[in-house]
């Protein structure tokens, strides 16, 4: 025998109390497929979440986070603050890159400068706490005749511009 | 209480900004939406602002309305008007969380004729 | 698109009879529709929501049904007062922040 509530589509449920009829999901619940006996709270967006898409019969609400925030992990289950960039989010608080790290982002953490001699370049541009080194073309390229790139004088402290 | 305001006679693509003031609750906290409905005609759904501050339109008036809001008023801004726009526009807040129109206005009339 | 077909257009019955109104779904919405009754010259009037749920203020002789594409509005023990014109509303999200809240196109009830 086929099971009656199998004819119960997303958005109700079996019920049980009325002879296994599909009876709509109540507000804030929801059946994302169909046969269900019971119907799912929905998810509320509240404090620094903020409702990106509002809960319906059929599936979840969707949150995010409010501006100064960002999500983590899946379905935005956390909101984790933000830094400027050239910063990065710590115990205390959201902390400049340390010299010689950078983060072009407002999450995450900073990263060290790519180091240029490893693939054998030159740096181009210095890096800054928000941005990465450019690196230039390898040493030998700029023998005489090859380029009129000239390779910047080397700063006192690379990687930070002067105040 | 929720009223709308800004409806009136209007020249073929003229742009046109409606605006609904509310009262007795804080518009941050709920779906907005404005329908609107052309004389002895049925009712258009046009769009929504939600709690979270996003905005949804139905596929005819994406592009050519703009729903926005402050804390005491939501905006409906309309461009390239036609006669076909000619309707009361009608603004609600959501009921329960959801962006079904359940509190409504009284409406205003805009009409679009040269 | 969610195309709504409400059925009947019109619909004639004395006091106290039942009234039964329609509305098909073009697809599957699950059961987030709504009915609003409208008299002329007013708003809309919200009844129910959710397919089932009375909302606030609305007697209990209105009672939706329904769910995925077949949809019932039946208005029990009519009253003069019930002389409107009734819609049925979807509540259906598409791609790229488009919606497909579409309303069917109405229902009159009048009196014999």
């Known amino acids: 025998l086929q099971d009656p509530c199998s004819n119960c589509p997303a958005g109700t449920f079996c019920d049980n109390n009325r002879n296994q009829i599909c009876s709509p999901c109540p507000p804030n619940s929801f059946s994302s497929a169909g046969g269900q006996r019971t119907c799912d709270i929905c998810r509320q967006c509240k404090g620094v979440f903020r409702t990106r898409k509002e809960c319906s019969s059929t599936s979840n609400a969707e949150c995010d986070c409010t501006p100064g925030f960002h999500c983590l992990g899946a379905g935005c289950s956390m909101c984790e603050q933000d830094c400027k960039q050239g910063q990065e989010l710590t115990k205390k608080g959201c902390k400049d890159c340390c010299f010689g790290t950078f983060n072009d982002q407002k999450r995450g953490i900073c990263r060290p400068w790519t180091n240029c001699s490893l693939d054998g370049k030159s740096v181009l541009v210095n890096g800054t706490k928000e941005r990465d080194v450019v690196c230039g073309p390898s040493p030998a390229d700029l023998s005489p005749g090859a380029s009129s790139v000239t390779p910047p004088a080397p700063a006192r402290e690379p990687g930070h511009s002067p105040q | 209480s929720v009223e709308e305001s800004g409806g009136r006679l209007v020249t073929p693509g003229t742009p046109l900004t409606l605006t609904c003031t509310v009262s007795?609750?804080?518009?941050?906290?709920?779906?907005m939406i404005w329908v609107r409905q052309a004389p002895g005609e049925g009712l258009q759904y046009i769009g929504f602002i939600n709690d979270g501050d996003y905005t949804y339109y139905t596929n005819w008036a994406k592009g050519r309305f703009t729903i926005s809001r402050t804390s005491t008023t939501v905006d409906l801004k309309m461009t390239s008007l036609t006669a076909a726009d000619t309707a009361t526009y009608f603004c609600a807040r959501g009921v329960d969380g959801t962006s079904y129109p359940g509190l409504w206005g009284p409406g205003t009339l805009v009409t679009v004729s040269s | 698109d969610v195309v709504m077909t409400q059925t009947p257009a019109s619909v004639s019955e004395p006091v106290r009879a039942t009234v039964t109104i329609k509305c098909q779904a073009s697809?599957?919405?699950?059961?987030?529709l709504a009915w609003y009754q409208q008299k002329p010259g007013q708003p809309p009037k919200l009844l129910i929501y959710r397919a089932s749920t009375l909302a606030s203020g609305v007697p209990s002789r209105f009672s939706g049904s329904g769910s995925g594409t077949e949809f019932t509005l039946t208005i029990s023990d009519l009253e003069c007062a019930d002389a409107a014109t009734y819609y049925c509303q979807c509540i259906y999200y598409g791609t790229d922040d488009v919606i497909y809240h579409t309303f069917g196109g109405g229902t009159e009830v009048v009196f014999k």
């Open positions: 007795g609750f804080t518009i941050s906290s709920h779906h």
């Open positions: 697809q599957s919405i699950g059961a987030d």
